[in-house]
Interface confidence: low
């Protein structure tokens, strides 16, 4: 057959769906690879063809659209499973073609099993809520397009295994779950089960997301440098190892880039000739406040190095701060025979 623009296997879009639930999968060609949509392609006389490769097989085969109750069907650029089965797992390909044009992409589909408490190998989206910040809401994700607006689904929310009913600070409001005040105790997995009728059958959609309660912006402060500080002096003799930690606390800030860096005599360590190494470690609190430590190390310090200015800098969306380390050369201990004797008037 003629050449086809093959976008390969799009592993960035690893699609996971639950067993025995409806799934609607849009052909990724129109979303991520081509500059036109399905309607335009269809009007131009292009046809969308679907096929698949079963798990652990090499053979591409057509999708069977003649299963009982139309279990698998195609509607425009969407492949429908009503519902999925475990052995639907595999790599699916959608190909757009006519006599002169061809473009295709494959993507992996994994049908996943869940237990009665909604535990599964499914990768869960994370929704961050600010601690003690007032009313915040999460919305049952990825349910658009499964049923028309005339259908009134029932939605049940669970935290872990438990149905949410009269929780002190969490209220189900249909597709929304309202956190009247988010607390650390609200951390966990929340599941919405959407039940809707279609052609005399009842379908369930299960969506689980992880709620992580994080530091509130009303409590956020600019970076705080705990070290270096005015109370610690790094006093070294030439030839000794100089170790200066720069320890900085960052309040949690959504989408903020936290940075810590050293300057030596106003320059970045990479831009100077001395043999400096910098090691960084990062730790997080329960509300995702961050503490970064960068240890500046000079293995064998020279007297010149001990005269330099060592400044720790930190920056977040809340501001930028800097603190100089107090570095000095250790005064050698007096040699008894000379200095001490002089003190007694010896000549």
């Amino acid at each position: 057959s003629e050449r086809c623009d093959d976008w390969g296997l799009d592993t960035m879009r690893q699609i996971q769906v639950f067993e025995d639930e409806p799934a609607r999968i849009k052909c990724p060609l129109f979303e991520h690879f081509l500059k036109f949509n399905y309607s335009t392609a269809h009007s131009a006389g292009l046809t969308l063809i679907w096929y698949w490769t079963r798990q652990d097989r090499d053979l591409e085969e057509p999708i069977n659209f003649r299963l009982p109750e139309n279990r698998i069907s195609k509607e425009k650029d969407v492949l429908w499973f009503r519902p999925t089965l475990l052995n639907d797992t595999g790599n699916y390909t959608c190909m757009l073609r006519n006599t002169t044009y061809c473009s295709k992409v494959a993507f992996p589909l994994e049908v996943v099993q869940k237990d009665s408490c909604f535990n599964s190998p499914m990768k869960l989206p994370v929704h961050k809520l600010y601690i003690e910040y007032g009313i915040q809401r999460i919305t049952c994700p990825n349910v658009d397009g499964y049923f028309p607006s005339s259908v009134k689904p029932t939605i049940t929310w669970y935290m872990g295994c438990y149905k949410i009913q009269n929780f002190n600070n969490v209220i189900p409001e249909g597709m929304n779950l309202s956190f009247l005040i988010a607390l650390i105790s609200n951390n966990g997995n929340y599941t919405c089960v959407v039940t809707y009728p279609e052609n005399g059958r009842t379908f369930h959609l299960t969506r689980t997301l992880t709620v992580k309660v994080v530091g509130s912006p009303k409590n956020a402060v600019p970076p705080v440098i705990h070290s270096p500080n005015d109370h610690v002096v790094y006093e070294k003799e030439p030839g000794e190892e100089l170790l200066i930690p720069c320890t900085v606390y960052f309040s949690f800030l959504m989408d903020s880039r936290n940075e810590v860096w050293w300057t030596i005599d106003g320059k970045k360590p990479d831009d100077i000739t001395i043999d400096v190494t910098i090691n960084e470690s990062i730790s997080h609190s329960r509300t995702e406040d961050e503490t970064r430590t960068q240890i500046l190390s000079i293995k064998k310090v020279t007297s010149e190095d001990l005269k330099r200015s060592y400044v720790c800098h930190a920056r977040s969306a809340k501001g930028e701060v800097a603190k100089a380390a107090k570095v000095k050369q250790k005064v050698p201990a007096p040699r008894y025979t000379v200095e001490l004797a002089c003190g007694f008037g010896a000549t």
């Epitope: 809401r137 349910v143 658009d144 009134k152 409001e173 249909g174 597709m175 929304n176 309202s178 009247l180």
Partner: antibody, heavy 118, light 110 residues
Framework: EVQVVESGGGLVKPGGSLRLSCAAS????????MSWVRQAPGKGLEWVGR??????????DYAAPVKGRFTISRDDSKNTLYLQMNSLKTEDTAVYYC?????????WGQGALVTVSS | QSVLTQPPSASGTPGQRVTISCSGN????????VNWFQQLPGTAPKLLIY???QRPSGVPDRFSGSKSGTSASLAISGLQSEDEADYYC???????????FGGGTKLTVL
């Protein structure tokens, strides 16, 4: 900053109709449940009704005194909530407040005065 | 006649602690969270307490809420002149399928 602003209040004769609007901003209106609460002059607060978000079916609930006469609707493209009031009675005279939420009314507008009098 | 019962008035002197009660039944306060609203003279109501004893940001911790069975109460400690207002309790009512309010309590700071 969350804001809800009512408009459309005024004087109307008994049996007449009036439509109140509520313009919302500062939050994802399409996902929010919205409610109307009223307050007759010198009296307490009275819940009128609520509308769920479209994703929750967009269904409405009404207090018994207004059921069948009042209709709550929404236009998510305009971030606007409406209260259509028909067959108005003198006892419907009140300040009408638009509020966010279906159970917990976290933000309120300044209110729109509706006077039903001949 | 309101579904939730509140005393029509309450009073206290500056610095004092006052409590406003709100009584309901199993289909409202007994089953659902209680909200308290403050309405200062000539202004729109403002959410004061929700879900037993949670305060929106900006509400001083002098205001606290509690709930026991089918009754709830609002306590204001260290009373200040600016607390003079009408206070309303509210809850969802299962049997009426709607939100019910108390009749309101007028608080006077003497």
């Amino acid at each position: 900053e969350v804001q809800v602003v009512e408009s459309g209040g005024g004087l109307v004769k008994p049996g007449g109709s009036l439509r109140l609007s509520c313009a919302a901003s500062g939050f994802i209106f399409s996902k929010a449940w919205m409610s109307w609460v009223r307050q007759a002059p010198g009296k307490g607060l009275e819940w009128v009704g609520r509308i769920k978000s479209k994703t929750d079916g967009g269904t409405t609930d009404y207090a018994a005194p207004v059921k069948g006469r009042f209709t709550i609707s929404r236009d998510d493209s305009k971030n606007t909530l409406y209260l259509q009031m028909n067959s108005l009675k003198t006892e419907d005279t009140a300040v009408y407040y638009c509020t966010t939420g279906g159970y917990v009314f976290d933000y309120w507008g300044q209110g729109a005065l509706v006077t039903v009098s001949s | 006649q309101s579904v939730l019962t509140q005393p029509p008035s309450a009073s206290g002197t500056p610095g004092q602690r006052v409590t406003i009660s709100c009584s309901g039944n199993n289909s409202n306060i007994g089953s659902y969270i209680v909200n308290w609203f403050q309405q200062l003279p000539g202004t729109a109501p403002k959410l004061l307490i929700y879900s037993k004893n949670q305060r929106p940001s900006g509400v001083p911790d002098r205001f606290s809420g509690s709930k026991s069975g089918t009754s709830a109460s609002l306590a204001i400690s260290g009373l200040q002149s600016e607390d003079e207002a009408d206070y309303y309790c509210a809850a969802w009512d299962d049997s009426l399928n709607g939100v019910v309010f108390g009749g309101g309590t007028k608080l006077t700071v003497l």
